[in-house]
């Protein structure tokens, strides 16, 4: 029978007594940089090829045996998972292997850093087609090692990576935290994020989704015919690689942050118990699970959205938080969260030459984050109209003043340090949906797009009784662009996207009153491209 | 990408043999060699695998015992000796490129005749 | 191991199509993804036809296709033609080893 990992990643129209989906990601080539492999086993033979760079630290203590079958051991079995014969996710990718891990599975920034400029050096000689890195390791936080990666990515080239195996941050470790770098912790058979003896698998916002990694069955180098069970977030990363190479050979023109967008649009969503993961990186952590896509052809017509988070900005009055999007992608919204609620909002402004989202701390809080809403919009033209605050009691507007550009977002930013305490709330008069409303106090940021075929519209969900949490979904076809809380609210800490719903949190309702002042409205921008349908229903 | 076997061979019951093969044209620690006999009128028949990467093998349960397949990288060769052989080993003996046998010798006889 | 099952022989009219059962277990055929087919003139090594159950090696003619149900894989050669006639051999994995069908004889009338 299937092993429950290739059946978990696969969509059921794909199902019946054995995995075979369409094309193997024979067009992709998927660089595996781990230990030793023994690359005639009868589950990986003529896929991989061996090249002949190696850089390796000495293998540590005096009565180490080194044991061939246990040095090829953990980069065989993840040769096995990217494209074994019967247990592998994409069974037509080739592959080579740089080793950089030691007999004990150890290895250096150095020798790291030497292997990716191996690959950039053969893809400048022979440029072949579409070009995976699997990096199933993990060392401490190096800024040296994330921009070689950054650079990788640049030329074209998808890199995915372990999250790690320390129950920890996984933006305190290197590849893992490098943004271009797709990132990957583990999760069970009852998608449950895995638990590695005292320590399990990595979390929060520098992991990009989650895949299979534990018990996952794979080519052993006890014998040619051998499999054996793996578990780690190495195993997760394989998964993603094979995922990728089958993607990348369906559409081979696929940018880094389209696939990435793909990736996260097709996994399982929501299904991933957060209480595993520490309290404070529950709202960070993507509750995401990768799977293939149900085809690998048509997807190009929807409008590809996810959600950024900065890191912490630090308690300081002044601190700020940074979200940005990658190169590729257009920032359509920004909005921002704290947990103590003191917050002073949160703008879009350029930085580089391109749009990022900042979020300012507030005297007494205890910090805040930035929170993207990055897209994939082709021949975008986005603005940022700014409304400074009002003298009229009516509020701050700002609306899309330019024909033919939307709303995708709104954000507001203040000066005072408590906004809104003693406030009534303000609400958006009826039949103006294409402006931003905040306090007059506020200056207001409207994020204005032009597309073509781009349409969106505002969806709002009000609750007039307090409430820690209130949400908002965009309709199926529809993407979610923008997610604010309207204002009035005091006691709101942010407002955040979650793959398709706007969530706003609020502080805790039992220290709250049940006035008017309690009432929480959420507010969603939905948006779709016509011209990206019919796109493809052309090319189909 | 070529496998070059030794020429015939004629062996008295009881004799060992040794059958060559010579692989070229491509990576060999990327693949092992099987071999496989297929006796006069008779069908196929796997005898097992010899890894060139870490000399590594895989008999076939009838062949334990009899048979020693080895490789020597230096020389891109790997070797398939029988011993104690019977009449009943009289076959053509082929090598094969790994597990998934793509590519084939010419075949070598071996005759057990007294 | 055992062999796997094939008919002895088969034929077919030019032009025709014929196909060729390899009937195992769930040890080998039905367990794994890889059965293969091999095409044998007599004199001559065999050569692959089909690997992974339905894949063509580059040089091999589309006439010919492989396919698999639960324990029982398939080898189809469509618009038979006189340089088919050959014995085939079915092929698979086992959990250690490999094993061989015992061959058909194909003839082109």
């Known amino acids: 029978s299937i092993p429950w990992n290739l059946e978990r990643i696969t969509p059921p129209r794909y199902r019946a007594d054995e995995y075979q989906p369409p094309d193997g990601g024979s067009l992709v080539e998927v660089y595996l940089l781990d230990t030793s492999i023994q690359s005639d086993h009868r589950e990986i033979e003529g896929r991989v090829m061996v090249t002949d760079f190696e850089n390796v630290p000495e293998e540590d203590g005096t009565r180490f045996h080194r044991q061939a079958s246990k040095c090829d051991s953990h980069g065989t079995h993840l040769a096995g998972v990217v494209s074994g014969r019967d247990a592998g996710v994409a069974k037509g990718a080739s592959m080579r292997s740089l080793r950089v891990l030691n007999c004990q599975g150890k290895g250096t920034v150095s020798g790291t850093l030497i292997g990716l400029e191996f690959i950039r050096k053969s893809q400048l000689v022979q440029p072949v087609g579409p070009l995976v890195v699997l990096l199933p390791l993990a060392g401490g936080y190096s800024r040296v090692l994330n921009a070689a990666c950054q650079r990788l990515a640049r030329a074209g080239v998808v890199l995915v990576t372990a999250a790690g195996n320390f129950r920890d941050d996984a933006c305190l470790y290197s590849p893992a935290s490098a943004p271009e770098v797709i990132t990957v912790g583990a999760t069970n058979a009852q998608d449950q994020p895995v638990t590695l003896g005292t320590l399990g698998t990595n979390f929060g916002r520098c992991v990009d989704l989650f895949a299979p990694g534990e018990d996952i069955i794979g080519a052993s180098s006890d014998c040619s015919t051998c499999f054996v069970s793996q578990s780690g977030t190495s195993q997760a990363a394989a998964h993603v690689a094979g995922i990728a190479a089958m993607m990348l050979s369906a559409e081979p023109e696929l940018t880094l942050a389209e696939l990435r967008q793909r990736l996260i649009h097709f996994s399982a969503k929501d299904v991933i118990n957060e209480a595993w993961f520490p309290e404070d990186q529950r709202v960070l952590t993507p509750n995401l699970v990768a799977a293939l896509p149900p085809s690998t052809h048509g997807a190009g017509w929807q409008l590809f959205c996810r959600t950024v988070w900065s890191a912490h900005s630090g308690p300081t009055r002044m601190a700020t938080a940074v979200a940005r999007c990658a190169p590729d992608e257009e920032l359509l919204s920004c909005s921002s969260f704290s947990r103590s609620g003191k917050r002073r909002g949160e703008r879009m402004e350029a930085q580089g030459g391109k749009l990022v989202c900042r979020a300012h701390n507030a005297f007494g809080g205890e910090g805040v984050y930035a929170i993207a809403r990055c897209c994939l919009l082709p021949q975008a033209n986005c603005s940022v109209h700014t409304a400074p605050p009002a003298e009229a009691s009516m509020g701050t507007r700002v609306h899309c003043h330019q024909q033919g550009h939307v709303l995708t977002g709104c954000s507001s930013h203040w000066e005072v340090e408590d906004l809104g305490t003693h406030k009534p709330p303000v609400l958006r008069p009826r039949g103006q949906p294409n402006q931003c409303v905040g306090h007059r106090e506020a200056s207001i940021h409207a994020s204005c797009c032009h597309a073509p075929g781009l349409e969106c519209k505002v969806k709002e969900h009000g609750i007039p009784a307090p409430q820690e949490q209130v949400t908002v979904a965009c309709e199926e076809g529809w993407t979610l662009t923008g997610c604010s809380a309207l204002p009035g609210t005091s006691h709101v800490l942010g407002a955040y996207a979650v793959d398709n719903t706007c969530v706003v949190r609020s502080r805790d309702v039992s220290t709250t009153g049940s006035t008017s002042e309690g009432a929480v409205t959420a507010v969603a921008i939905c948006c779709r491209s016509r011209h990206l349908a019919q796109a493809s229903q052309e090319l189909q | 990408v070529q496998l070059v076997q030794s020429g015939a061979e004629v062996k008295k019951p009881g004799a060992s043999v040794k059958v060559s093969c010579k692989a070229s044209?491509?990576?060999?620690?990327?693949?092992?060699i099987s071999w496989v006999r297929q006796a006069p009128g008779q069908g196929l028949e796997w005898m097992g695998w010899?890894?060139?990467?870490?000399?590594?093998?895989n008999y076939a349960q009838k062949l334990q015992g009899r048979g020693t397949m080895t490789t020597d990288p230096s020389t891109s060769t790997a070797y398939m000796e029988l011993r104690s052989l019977r009449s009943d080993d009289t076959a053509v003996y082929y090598c094969?490129?790994?597990?998934?046998?793509?590519?084939w010798g010419q075949g070598t006889t071996v005759t057990v005749s007294s | 191991e055992s062999a796997l099952t094939q008919p002895a022989s088969v034929s077919g009219s030019p032009g025709q199509s014929i196909t060729i059962s390899c009937t195992g277990t769930?040890?080998?055929?039905?367990?794994?993804?890889?059965v293969s087919w091999y095409q044998q003139h007599p004199g001559k090594a065999p050569k692959l036809m089909i690997y992974?159950?339905?894949n063509r090696p580059s040089g091999v003619s589309n006439r010919f296709s492989g396919s698999k149900s639960g324990n029982t894989a398939s080898l189809t050669i469509s618009g038979l033609q006189a340089e088919d006639e050959a014995d085939y051999y079915c092929?698979?994995?086992?959990?250690?080893?490999?094993?061989f069908g015992g061959g058909t004889k194909l003839t082109v009338l």
């Open positions: 094969a490129r790994g597990y998934g046998m793509d590519v």
């Open positions: 044209g491509y990576t060999l620690t990327s693949y092992g």
């Open positions: 010899v890894s060139f990467y870490n000399g590594n093998t």
């Open positions: 769930s040890s080998d055929v039905g367990g794994y993804n890889s």
């Open positions: 992974e159950v339905s």
């Open positions: 092929n698979s994995y086992t959990s250690t080893s490999m094993v």
